[in-house]
């Protein structure tokens, strides 16, 4: 026979905060540490599980086959109900009835997810967006793995990501002084560095790379670096290449310079030799399979160099160099020096001896070509 | 067990074809680049072609280029050399190898067969 | 097409002995090289890949430098067992190029 349950015998609700999918324990204690008769119900008095003698029945709720409880716990008291692979709809007071007691407990379940595909390029945007029940007012915090705090209700907008930005997300969602988190893995599709600038003496071999910020089981798509000499009046397609699977084919090269591309990743291009005509800046792209948009890195590369003719020794650099870099002459083991901030130094009837040219930003070379001066004799007068 | 073996070789005259298989069993097949590398009797190794897992992509040396062709049938397990217009300098071992994992290096390698070009 | 030059082609040594042999791109191949070892009749054998990683099962005494253009292996404590001819080969792109050799001869 059951005995009613009066309003002194029905304990202060418990709030307890779930995740969408997760599992949940909803705890319930009886005073004595032994087996006793216990029902979970929901708001609706719909019995979910309960003991019938030594057994877990369970109920007509719509729980019935997410729901269980931990019957190796009964004999301590303990009659939690577990609810596997939560929904938003699972949200509701859940009482448990145990020793014509009434324990309440109010489960909110949330959900935090990325409108679109967790693999975002580099300046595009990041909404996540949080699913709650009717009726609750959760607060949203997220932090991203550079350390930047962004906060918000429902929605939450990164408006511009940045490869920084690429990592674990960590996001906390609060309700009635509780909390629970989310970790969300974003993935910034970039290349590792914007820009880079290789600095080569005039006939050295260049190499420039292209690291990518982030690693993918299968990649492919398609690229292109685009060159912009500084001597040219426009820009020309250097090489086209596909990608596929992390493997590099090349479908089209440009005569001069000839170009070797590497066939696997990272992406890596040789340039047989440093000349004058090459010098400028060059913007490699990458389009991705699936991907709107294409990922970008500049490339520049200056070349240095060193001449005599006749009386005049000159050191002429080309290519994007920027206005604080100090260009220098300077005889081995001697202070003659001639430094400037320009494109070109030159020493009119130089020494003779072993010279450096120098490309010099604040102090530290960037690029050094050595220059033999020999010894010129007047020529003898002729009788 | 990871294995590859060789068949196909033998005697030609020059300017004749010949085809070699290579059987492969205990990897995915379609998920390496292979090779034929050839080995002249007393000299040192040559690279003669190659095909790309992913894409299928073919290569060749330009000893061999227009002459040669590489192949595969996945559904075999079997990886092909079609040699056509044969030469005296052709005459070789021919290994077949298997790439490793994001071309780790030839990380398996046939015991080879022989392909003798003379009239 | 890159060419690979291999150095020495032949060397005389004793066990015990540390070896080194090298090999220089024509051009910049990062580290995508292998080395490998091979004995009279049989097939090739990787020993190291991508310039300085051991293959699985290969002793440690075999190992790999370099970057770029230069590369070496080195045998630390020469075995019997080791005497043999090496090749180095670039996968850096096709067609790929062995060295010439190096014959490694028991004095």
């Known amino acids: 026979e059951q005995k009613l349950i009066s309003e002194e015998d029905l304990a202060a609700k418990k709030v307890v905060l779930g995740k969408k999918g997760d599992t949940v324990e909803l705890t319930c204690n009886a005073s004595q540490k032994k087996n006793t008769q216990f029902h979970w119900k929901n708001s609706n008095q719909i019995k979910i599980l309960g003991i019938q003698g030594l057994f877990l029945t369970k109920g007509p709720s719509k729980l019935s086959d997410r729901a269980d409880s931990r019957k190796s716990l009964w004999d301590q008291g303990c009659f939690s109900m577990i609810i596997k692979n939560l929904k938003i709809e699972d949200s509701d007071t859940y009482i448990c009835e145990v020793e014509n007691k009434k324990e309440e407990v109010e489960l909110l379940v949330f959900g935090l997810t990325a409108n679109s595909d967790t693999h975002l390029l580099e300046g595009q945007s990041l909404t996540l967006t949080l699913e709650s029940p009717p009726g609750s007012s959760p607060s949203v915090k997220c932090r991203s793995p550079g350390g930047k705090n962004i906060q918000g209700g429902r929605t939450i907008s990164v408006p511009q990501l940045e490869r920084q930005d690429s990592g674990t997300w960590t996001c906390t969602v609060s309700q009635d002084q509780k909390t629970v988190e989310f970790k969300i893995d974003i993935v910034v599709l970039a290349f590792q560095k914007a820009s880079s600038t290789v600095y080569k003496k005039e006939g050295e071999q260049v190499e420039f790379s292209f690291p990518l910020a982030f690693t993918l089981e299968k990649l492919t798509g398609s690229g292109e670096l685009w060159w912009q000499a500084e001597r040219a009046s426009s820009s020309k397609s250097w090489i086209t290449f596909d990608l596929k699977n992390k493997e590099v084919s090349v479908k089209r090269v440009t005569q001069d310079p000839k170009l070797q591309m590497g066939k696997k990743l990272p992406l890596h291009l040789t340039l047989p030799q440093a000349l004058p005509q090459y010098a400028g800046s060059g913007n490699l792209t990458l389009a991705l399979e699936a991907k709107t948009g294409k990922l970008h890195q500049e490339v520049n590369l200056v070349v240095m160099r060193a001449t005599q003719f006749q009386e005049n020794l000159t050191c002429e650099v080309w290519g994007p160099t920027s206005p604080k870099l100090t260009l220098s002459l300077k005889l081995e083991n001697k202070g003659a020096t001639v430094s400037k901030q320009a494109k070109a130094v030159w020493v009119l009837n130089p020494e003779a001896g072993m010279w450096q040219c120098l490309l010099s930003d604040s102090g530290q070379v960037l690029l050094e070509s050595n220059i033999k001066v020999v010894p010129t004799w007047p020529t003898p007068v002729q009788p | 067990e990871v294995q590859l073996l060789e068949s196909g070789g033998g005697l030609v005259q020059p300017g004749g074809s010949l085809r070699l298989s290579c059987a492969a069993s205990g990897f995915t097949f379609s998920s390496y680049a292979m090779s034929w590398v050839r080995q002249a009797p007393g000299k040192g190794l040559e690279w003669v072609s190659g095909i790309s897992g992913s894409v299928g992509s073919t290569y060749y040396a330009d000893s061999v280029k227009g002459r040669f062709t590489i192949s595969r049938d996945k559904s075999k397990n079997t990886l092909y050399l079609q040699m056509n217009s044969l030469r005296a300098e052709d005459t070789a071992v021919y290994y077949c190898?298997?790439?490793?994992?994001?071309?780790?290096?030839?990380?398996?390698w046939g015991k080879g067969t022989t392909v003798t070009v003379s009239s | 097409a890159i060419q690979m030059t291999q150095s020495p082609s032949s060397l005389s040594a004793f066990v015990g002995d540390r070896v080194t042999i090298t090999c220089r791109a024509s051009q910049g191949i990062r580290n995508d090289l292998g080395w490998y070892q091979q004995k009279p009749g049989k097939a090739p054998k990787l020993l190291i890949y991508?310039?300085?990683s051991l293959q699985s099962g290969v002793p440690s005494r075999f190992s790999g430098s370099g970057s770029g253009t230069d590369f070496t292996l080195t045998i630390s404590s020469l075995q019997p067992e080791d005497f043999a001819t090496y090749y180095c080969l670039q996968d850096y792109n096709y067609p790929y190029t062995f060295g010439q050799g190096t014959k490694l001869e028991i004095k």
């Open positions: 190898a298997k790439e490793g994992y994001d071309w780790s290096g030839m990380d398996v």
């Open positions: 991508a310039a300085s």
